[in-house]
């Protein structure tokens, strides 16, 4: 025997209080598949969330984050504060990367400059808070009289963090 509710299309629900008549979803609710016994409450995009797509009777609202925040999680379920490049987010707010570390993103944490000497190379371009160092040829490869820039970059061996 066919379930009488299966004929209720998306945007409606099978109303048990009215002899399983297909009733439209009430305001601020939706059903995205047929045969639903109830409509789901629409997601509210509040606070740091803003509406990317409004809720309709057949599909949920979609949110993203207000400017200055970025999405995390499925369907942008979380918003985390942005920082500038060269900074990382702490509980006390955005803090500049410590000397010898950098962050080239608006999110995430600072990480140490590459230690060129571990690969037998020299520093071609100094690192900054926003950019890693650029490693060049090994000092032995440099022509006589040429000098290489060697800032005091922290060790970047696997498993070591800047202290």
């Amino acid at each position: 025997l066919q379930d009488p509710c299966s004929k209720c299309p998306a945007g409606t629900f099978c109303d048990n209080n009215r002899n399983q008549i297909c009733s439209p979803c009430p305001p601020n609710s939706f059903s995205s598949t047929s045969g639903q016994k109830a409509c789901d409450i629409c997601r509210q995009c509040e606070g740091v969330f803003r509406t990317k797509k409004v809720c309709s009777s057949t599909s949920n609202a979609e949110c993203d984050c207000t400017p200055g925040f970025h999405c995390l999680g499925a369907g942008c379920s979380m918003c985390e504060q942005d920082c500038k490049q060269g900074q990382e987010l702490t509980k006390k707010g955005c803090k500049d990367c410590c000397f010898g570390t950098f962050n080239d993103q608006k999110r995430g944490i600072c990480r140490p400059w590459t230690n060129c000497s571990l690969d037998g190379k020299s520093v071609l371009v100094n690192g900054t808070k926003e950019r890693d160092v650029v490693c060049g040829p090994s000092p032995a490869d440099l022509s006589p009289g040429a000098s290489s820039v060697t800032p005091p970059a922290p060790a970047r061996e696997p498993g070591h963090s800047p202290q």
Epitope: L72, G73, A74, M78, E80, I109, R111
Partner: antibody, heavy 116, light 109 residues
Framework: QVQLVQSGAEVKKPGESLKISCKGS????????ISWVRQMPGKGLEWMGK????????NYSPSFQGQVTISADKSISTAYLQWSSLKASDTAMYYC?????????WGQGTLVTVSS | DIELTQPPSVSVAPGQTARISCSGD??????AHWYQQKPGQAPVVVIY???NRPSGIPERFSGSNSGNTATLTISGTQAEDEADYYC???????????FGGGTKLTVLG
């Protein structure tokens, strides 16, 4: 949509080596940290370490430093966790997760069983 | 590194309030996050950055964090809330993440 898909369950003998994987899709794999988390049978979550796939910078929990190696190949959006010599005490579920503080996406877990 | 201590188990009657504590030296100086894990499943964030609730997580979940204790509160606990709960924090001292030992929440009845 964002997904982290881990390699399948492994059964190994003590002393053997192993490398398990975590493939990311649906986002810019290179620019998000990947962490590895251990859960021994009936026990809690333990953070093992993390990697930034963009440049393969790694950072380990003191408890796991020297015990495992975390690596990544950004060209195939995959992070790895490896052991050179497994012990029976390495028997656990291993999860990869996106992030360093807030872990917003998790792999399904890889069960590693080490038994003679 | 900071150590986070949670009670191994908490029991609550349906409809009552469950509180799970997470204590650690000056944890209030860091963000605390809370994860729910049900048997055979990966953990899921229920509270992030001390008190923020991801969309899709019921309003009965809330969090606070100050001094040496972070707390996860579940008001009007339901049977489906029965799970293991873990607190965690990221510390800028060792650049590491630490999890609490976990708390098994049992909903009685």
């Amino acid at each position: 949509q964002v997904q982290l898909v881990q390699s399948g369950a492994e059964v190994k003998k003590p002393g053997e080596s192993l490398k398990i994987s975590c493939k990311g899709s649906g986002y810019s794999f290179s620019t998000y940290w990947i962490s590895w988390v251990r859960q021994m049978p009936g026990k809690g979550l333990e953070w093992m370490g993390k990697i930034y796939p963009g440049d393969s910078y790694t950072n380990y929990s003191p408890s796991f430093q020297g015990q495992v190696t975390i690596s990544a190949d950004k060209s195939i959006s995959t992070a790895y966790l490896q052991w050179s010599s497994l012990k029976a005490s390495d028997t656990a579920m291993y999860y990869c997760a996106r992030g360093y503080g807030i872990f917003d996406y998790w792999g399904q877990g890889t069960l590693v069983t080490v038994s003679s | 590194d900071i150590e986070l201590t949670q009670p191994p188990s908490v029991s609550v009657a349906p409809g009552q309030t469950a509180r799970i504590s997470c204590s650690g030296d000056n944890i209030g100086d860091q963000y605390a996050h809370w994860y729910q894990q049900k048997p055979g499943q990966a953990p899921v964030v229920v509270i992030y950055q001390d008190k923020n609730r991801p969309s899709g997580i019921p309003e009965r979940f809330s969090g606070s964090n100050s001094g040496n204790t972070a707390t996860l509160t579940i008001s009007g606990t339901q049977a489906e809330d029965e799970a293991d709960y873990y607190c965690s924090t990221y510390t800028f001292v060792g650049f590491t993440t630490v999890f609490g030992g976990g708390t098994k929440l049992t909903v009685l009845g």
